[in-house]
Amino acid sequence: LKGQEFAPSHQQVYAPLRADGDKPRAHLTVVRQTPTQHFKNQFPALHWEHELGLAFTKNRMNYTNKFLLIPESGDYFIYSQVTFRGMTSECSEIRQAGRPNKPDSITVVITKVTDSYPEPTQLLMGTKSVCEVGSNWFQPIYLGAMFSLQEGDKLMVNVSDISLVDYTKEDKTFFGAFLL
Amino acid sequence: LKGQEFAPSHQQVYAPLRADGDKPRAHLTVVRQTPTQHFKNQFPALHWEHELGLAFTKNRMNYTNKFLLIPESGDYFIYSQVTFRGMTSECSEIRQAGRPNKPDSITVVITKVTDSYPEPTQLLMGTKSVCEVGSNWFQPIYLGAMFSLQEGDKLMVNVSDISLVDYTKEDKTFFGAFLL
Amino acid sequence: LKGQEFAPSHQQVYAPLRADGDKPRAHLTVVRQTPTQHFKNQFPALHWEHELGLAFTKNRMNYTNKFLLIPESGDYFIYSQVTFRGMTSECSEIRQAGRPNKPDSITVVITKVTDSYPEPTQLLMGTKSVCEVGSNWFQPIYLGAMFSLQEGDKLMVNVSDISLVDYTKEDKTFFGAFLL
């Protein structure tokens, strides 16, 4: 293994070297959602395609029951886009009861669940007021950032209203993560 | 430095180690677009600056004729932002004929062309209805995600209407990819 | 043309190997902003949380006085999201004097400051016209891309109007960078 020593003396290496192709990675794509129960005060979670088309999981990054399972501690870049679409001829039509003067909105949250911590942690949130004049509207919310995760953490994507999610194409709504 | 060899036997390395600085990478920036032919049913492709200002290509990642050329198989993070701007005093003014009740829209697609598949593959799409009341409007669409690409694949960015793309500044409209 | 076949990727290693866990990285999160002086013709810079909650800096990447300090030359992925919110019942209410027919807007700029260069460099800009009919509006602008940075460079996030930035939650407004 001598030839693979990284030896230049100025180089401080504090962690073992590892092959990039061996890092946990996943890109999940949208599927048609089935209405599911969700906790009060918590937005419903999307479920995902993990192996067909553009979707994949690799190197011990697994997907199960709406969650990406983190197999190894480290810093991960996590991203998601959700495309929403709705039909409304004026703002007031999709206004929820009891919300006078508060605009309608669409929200995406990437959430971390840790067994050792009772409350889910919101890592990323994209939220947008919607007050479209046209009869049909559609728009994406994109999120992405780096987080330090622990082995065993679980990631999910929550949305304010599952019925507004565009599930028609794998390139419009997606969710991914990779170890840096 | 012998002890710093990456040899610990518990470490499964399934791929050859390689220096990060040697990985294919590119960040391309907007230039003024010239109208070009494009396939029926396919949005026109943008062309890009690849060496001036903030733009660069490195480590065998090349740009030619609207395409980023993938020199090595692997997992890439691909991203683009396109800033659109238009002028309209009401929604109906930029409405295309024959599209009653369908909102005007702006769309960005990152497309992969591969020799092993006759159809270009849409990797990422950002699409947004536009129904602006103001006389001038502008807004960005951002996309980014990870994909498994093959040596020889080509990437391009397609837009719904080239004439609406803001080509004035390199920080407003851009396209990039890097091997993870 | 034999030479134009792409060479096996595992062979040419032009840079020393280094452990991924040792790379400079930071994720900063929003704090309540205090009004600060800023240069004429330059948007004000946000300041950030760098160690509490989801925020961190590591491996010689430091945060000081609104700036992320780049400790090592290389290619970095840089990202930010700023969530804006405002109150207006019609477009004209937040219109600045002397800007007839020009839409109100929100803008985020990620800026690089280099000691050896007199002018800051705008790396990324997200700018959006705002003409909301509803009485309260809110929306994010997300940016992210890869840039070649030099040791000693400083990064900051500038916004068009600090008073419109949503500083209430660390997942809504953030700024990060990591060495690739």
């Epitope: - | 396939f39 396919q42 591969t114 020799d115 598949y117 006759p118 159809e119 270009p120 | 043309l1 134009q4």
Partner: antibody
Framework: QVQLQESGPGLVRPSQTLSLTCTVS????????IHWVRQRPGRGLEWMGR????????KYNPSLKSRVTITRDTSKNQVSLRLSSVTAADTAVYYC?????????WGQGSLVTVSS | DIQMTQSPSSLSASVGDRVTITCRAS?????MYWYQQKPGKAPKDLIY???NLASGVPSRFSGSGSGTDFTFTISSLQPEDIATYYC?????????FGQGTKVEIK
């Protein structure tokens, strides 16, 4: 409309080099990939290789790699095939074909006979 | 190399019959492609990426399968379908074709 047209000599002497040109029209050559496929008399189809005209990047059938060269001239909308050291076993109809567009297209084929 | 084994090598069926051709790859592939070649003509795309109908191809043609086993079907054979049909995989190098199935009318 999309067209691919093979051209070249119909007769090549043994041990010489076979040269064919594929001229395309109706699409941007650099947007796609061009393949060469041959069909020997009474036999099936054999993929010879392909070029990405945008980059010049080529892939060849390993069984032919030592003898085949594919190049492109985007200014003329042409892709060329050269097969060296031919024998009678190289007698075939040679097709150029496109992939990477909305549909694949094939040329009509060019019969090349190797004979002295 | 990925070898493609196509069967049968020839078949004879009546107009209106359902015709099935199979193709087996020596290694798993993501997609299979099917072509039709009439005597003296260039091959024509029929099915791409296993199950997608190429532009202008009648709906009586279909494809299915995954991994190593793929199937091409003509749901109701027509006189104009007399031709040789080839499968092809595009993933390994070389891009290999099956040896062809010649379809005739009884």
């Amino acid at each position: 409309q999309v067209q691919l047209q093979e051209s070249g000599p119909g007769l090549v002497r043994p041990s010489q080099t076979l040269s064919l040109t594929c001229t395309v029209s109706g699409f941007d050559l650099q947007d796609t990939y061009i393949h060469w496929v041959r069909q020997r008399p009474g036999r099936g189809l054999e993929w010879m290789g392909r070029i990405d005209p945008a980059s010049g990047h080529v892939k060849y059938n390993p069984s032919l790699k030592s003898r085949v060269t594919i190049t492109r001239d985007t200014s003329k909308n042409q892709v060329s095939l050269r097969l060296s050291s031919v024998t009678a076993a190289d007698t075939a109809v040679y097709y150029c074909a496109r992939s990477g567009g909305m549909t694949d297209y094939w040329g009509q084929g060019s019969l090349v006979t190797v004979s002295s | 190399d990925i070898q493609m084994t196509q069967s049968p090598s020839s078949l004879s069926a009546s107009v209106g019959d359902r015709v099935t051709i199979t193709c087996r790859a020596s290694f798993s592939v993501d997609y299979m492609y099917w072509y039709q070649q009439k005597p003296g003509k260039a091959p024509k795309d029929l099915i791409y990426a296993t199950s997608n109908l190429a532009s202008g191809v009648p709906s009586r043609f279909s494809g299915s399968g995954s991994g190593t086993d793929f199937t091409f079907t003509i749901s109701s054979l027509q006189p104009e379908d007399i031709a040789t049909y080839y499968c092809q995989q595009w993933e390994g190098n070389p891009r290999s074709f099956g040896q062809g199935t010649k379809v005739e009318i009884k």
